[in-house]
Interface confidence: low
């Protein structure tokens, strides 16, 4: 039973530190006094001192808040030795998994996206794709899952719903007929990316859609 199940620790913990996580215990302590130690990145190698162990009790200690976006998993080794320094157990693998908090906002890859579409196209025509990233976890949680939306369109002509955006892919498409370069040569969309699949933090960017001439007006002489 010289085994420890993977330990989950939320990032950005408020403490107080040091915080007891789990207890290493060798059943050889019935026969002799045991001293415990840990090695590995996060203990005795960079980043040193994140984790420590109470030498006599075996309590594994966390000394400071963790950042999942910096290190998502620590692999340490636990050691048990007798008073005379002889190893009484094989080194034990200790996995510490840092669980995600929604501590990052989405970020658009550009402040301004530019695209173009031919005037008079049918609804459903794709115009461009925008992208936002979020450093938080998007596999086990929704913290880093981004949902896209259009907040506003200017000008609002012929009306304010000329475009739509796919909430998952960020693809902007024409949703209404009536694009006419002679009337409106360019639309400015304020787009939003919201994490937690639409229920979290929001960031904003701009998508500029140029309406291209379809040569529907004969030149006048």
């Amino acid at each position: 039973d010289w085994v420890v199940a993977p330990i989950s620790v939320p990032e950005n913990g408020k403490g107080p530190f040091p915080q007891r996580l789990n207890q290493l215990k060798s059943n050889k302590d019935r026969d002799t006094k045991i001293f415990y130690s840990i090695t590995g990145p996060g203990a005795d190698s960079p980043p040193e001192g994140v984790f420590a162990v109470e030498k006599e009790t075996g309590w594994l200690l966390l000394n400071k808040p963790l950042d999942r976006e910096e290190i998502a998993k620590y692999e340490l080794f636990g050691h048990a030795v007798s008073e005379n320094g002889a190893s009484v157990e094989d080194p034990m693998n200790i996995s510490i998994i840092v669980t995600d908090q929604n501590d990052h906002k989405p970020k658009f890859t550009q402040d301004t996206f530019r695209g173009s579409v031919l005037e008079g196209v049918l609804p459903g025509t794709s115009v461009m794709q925008v992208t936002a990233t979020d450093e938080d976890d998007a596999i086990y949680t929704y913290n880093g899952v981004v949902a896209y939306s259009i907040h506003s369109q200017e000008p609002k002509d012929p009306h304010d719903l000329m475009f739509t955006i796919h909430r998952s892919t960020g693809t902007i498409s024409v949703i209404s007929s009536g694009l006419d370069r002679e009337k409106v040569p360019e639309y400015t969309l304020t787009i939003q990316a919201t994490d937690m699949d639409g229920d979290g933090s929001t960031t904003t960017a701009v998508a500029v859609v140029e309406i291209l001439d379809a040569n529907d007006n004969a030149p006048m002489f």
Epitope: H151, P155, K183, P185, E186, T188, T202, T203, T204
Partner: antibody, heavy 123, light 106 residues
Amino acid sequence: QVQLQQSGPGLVKPSQTLSLTCAISGDSVSSQSAAWNWIRQSPSRGLEWLGRIYYRSKWYNDYALSVKSRITINPDTSKNQFSLQLNSVTPEDTAVYYCARGEGYGREGFAIWGQGTLVTVSS
Amino acid sequence: DIQMTQSPSSLSASVGDRVTITCRASQTISNTLAWYQQKPGKAPKLLIYAASNLQSGVPSRFSGSGSGTDFTLTISSLQPEDFATYYCQQYLSWFTFGQGTKVEIK
């Protein structure tokens, strides 16, 4: 650099029309990348955006709901200026009125302002 | 309409002090926020746009932060010319201003 110069009367009688003009130098009222705004400031209402015009191959305007039924903002391309008309004024409309330029549609704030005109509504 | 609430409404400070003014929006506005400085008898002057971008020509002692609903304007070391009234303004949905924060000499 862009400058805005305001002109217009400082005293207007109740129920009459308030008229102000904002002359633009260093830019064009027909710029495809600017919006031209009117904003007012009073002790009771603070800073209040009233409306704007902008040109994108044709003229567009947007007005604040609080004044929408009474306001008109017009461009004058020949004089490179734009004007504010506010009808049926009451003493509540007493304020310092500013014109201001917004980059694009105003997404970067109002960087250029006129000097302000104190308009008093009183008989 | 989106309401903008500033705090405090006034504060007294000395030259060299670090001054912080906060602004809260009635709904999330992402980073679509500007800060202005106004001196008596003058038009407002743009200091910060997009919540944290310093307007050209504005001293670096001014900085802005925040996103969503809560925003902060910080003056790292107050100078004599900084005594004025400061306004926040949102531009996500039309344009609305905070009620102002007057920074006075202690």
